[in-house]
């Protein structure tokens, strides 16, 4: 088994106020086994914003189909962007157990809020 | 409450073809991946074939491979799995069950009983 | 294929463990309870641990290396079944079950 590696490929991402934000993130392996979870934010103040074990998350969708077997996918749209919502979001791969317990995270994708056009 | 009720169970003999659907209701059908499994009389159960939400994507037993095809309609909550080159082990209950974000199974039909017999 | 005991045994209010090995660390194991043949499976335990929302609490599971456990504290008389394990692998994309374990409740 090929070295997890987490590829968020974007530093950054600018969305007006209103709008919907695309954040990228893809896997290279299955394994080990567990869940993505997204964060906006690091350390214990971090906020959850998708965990693909759990839901509903109102206003994230993913943007690939999570339902296939074989998915590495895990982009996500996080509609209705308000101020509130800037930060710097992490992908991050946890492995399974009693809890699950993080394995690896992305460099992370830093969303800014335009003002809403006039 | 999540349902699902499965038809198109029958005697047919061995050589032909048959169609079984599951009818979904109580959840969203089209943000689930779906499958089949069966259960020939006295035995244990067996993982038939799995789809994705979309339907995009399909999945196989090395037992039906070849002879049978699953797929969805999402504008009509139903589920398919078509057989074909019937044979006596084909003989089971077959169910289709909701997978969970692992692609194990939270719910499961009543089942319908194909008999393949000359 | 996993591997489950054929049959286990116990008087009311005992705990009963029954554990299922083979799935090797890629998997996610659960639990499927069928009172009578040919019925409808009940989920009991699905993602290792994860007990439905209308599932009683004196089922629970586990999962360590390759094994799952799955434990019934307190058993019942209505408990009588077949339990069946199930796994998902990653490496092949496949569902696989246990030939099932027969509980009997003296």
């Known amino acids: 088994e090929e070295e997890l590696q987490i590829i968020q490929p974007d530093k950054s991402v600018s969305v007006a106020a209103g709008e919907s934000a695309i954040l990228h993130c893809t896997i290279t392996s299955l394994f080990p086994v567990g869940p993505i979870q997204w964060f906006r934010g690091a350390g214990p103040a971090r906020v959850l914003i998708y965990n693909q074990r759990q839901g509903p998350f109102p206003r994230v969708t993913t943007v690939s189909e999570t339902t296939k077997r074989e998915n590495m996918d895990f982009s996500i749209s996080i509609s209705n962007i308000t101020p509130a919502d800037a930060g710097t979001y992490y992908c991050i791969k946890f492995r399974k157990g009693s809890p699950d317990t993080e394995f690896k995270s992305g460099a992370g994708t830093e969303l800014s809020v335009r003002a809403k056009p006039s | 409450d999540v349902q699902l009720v499965e038809s198109g169970g029958a005697v047919v003999r061995p050589g032909e073809t048959l169609r079984l659907s599951c009818t979904a209701s109580?959840?969203?059908?089209?943000?689930?991946?779906m499958s089949w499994v069966r259960q020939a009389p006295g035995k244990g159960l067996e993982w038939v074939s799995g789809i994705s939400a979309s339907g995009s994507d399909t999945y196989y037993a090395d037992s039906v491979k070849g002879r049978s095809t699953i797929s969805r309609d999402n504008s009509k909550n139903t589920l398919y799995l078509r057989m074909s080159s019937l044979t006596a082990e084909d003989t089971a209950v077959y169910y289709c069950?909701?997978?969970?974000?692992?692609?194990?199974?939270?719910?499961w039909g009543l089942g319908t009983l194909v008999t393949v017999s000359s | 294929a996993l591997t489950q005991p054929a049959s286990v045994s116990a008087n009311p209010g005992e705990t009963v463990k029954i554990t299922c090995s083979g799935g090797?660390?890629?998997?996610?194991y659960g639990w499927y309870q069928q009172k009578s043949p040919g019925s409808a499976p009940v989920t009991l335990i699905h993602s290792d641990d994860k007990r439905p929302s209308d599932i009683p609490s004196r089922f629970s599971g586990s999962a360590s290396g390759s094994t799952a456990t799955l434990t019934i504290t307190g058993v019942q008389v209505e408990d009588e079944a077949v339990y069946y394990c199930?796994?998902?692998?990653?490496?092949?994309?496949?569902?696989?079950f246990g030939a099932g374990t027969t509980l009997t409740v003296l």
């Open positions: 199930g796994g998902y692998d990653y490496t092949t994309y496949v569902n696989t």
């Open positions: 109580g959840f969203t059908f089209s943000s689930y991946a």
């Open positions: 090797g660390t890629s998997s996610y």
């Open positions: 069950a909701r997978e969970t974000w692992n692609h194990l199974f939270d719910y």
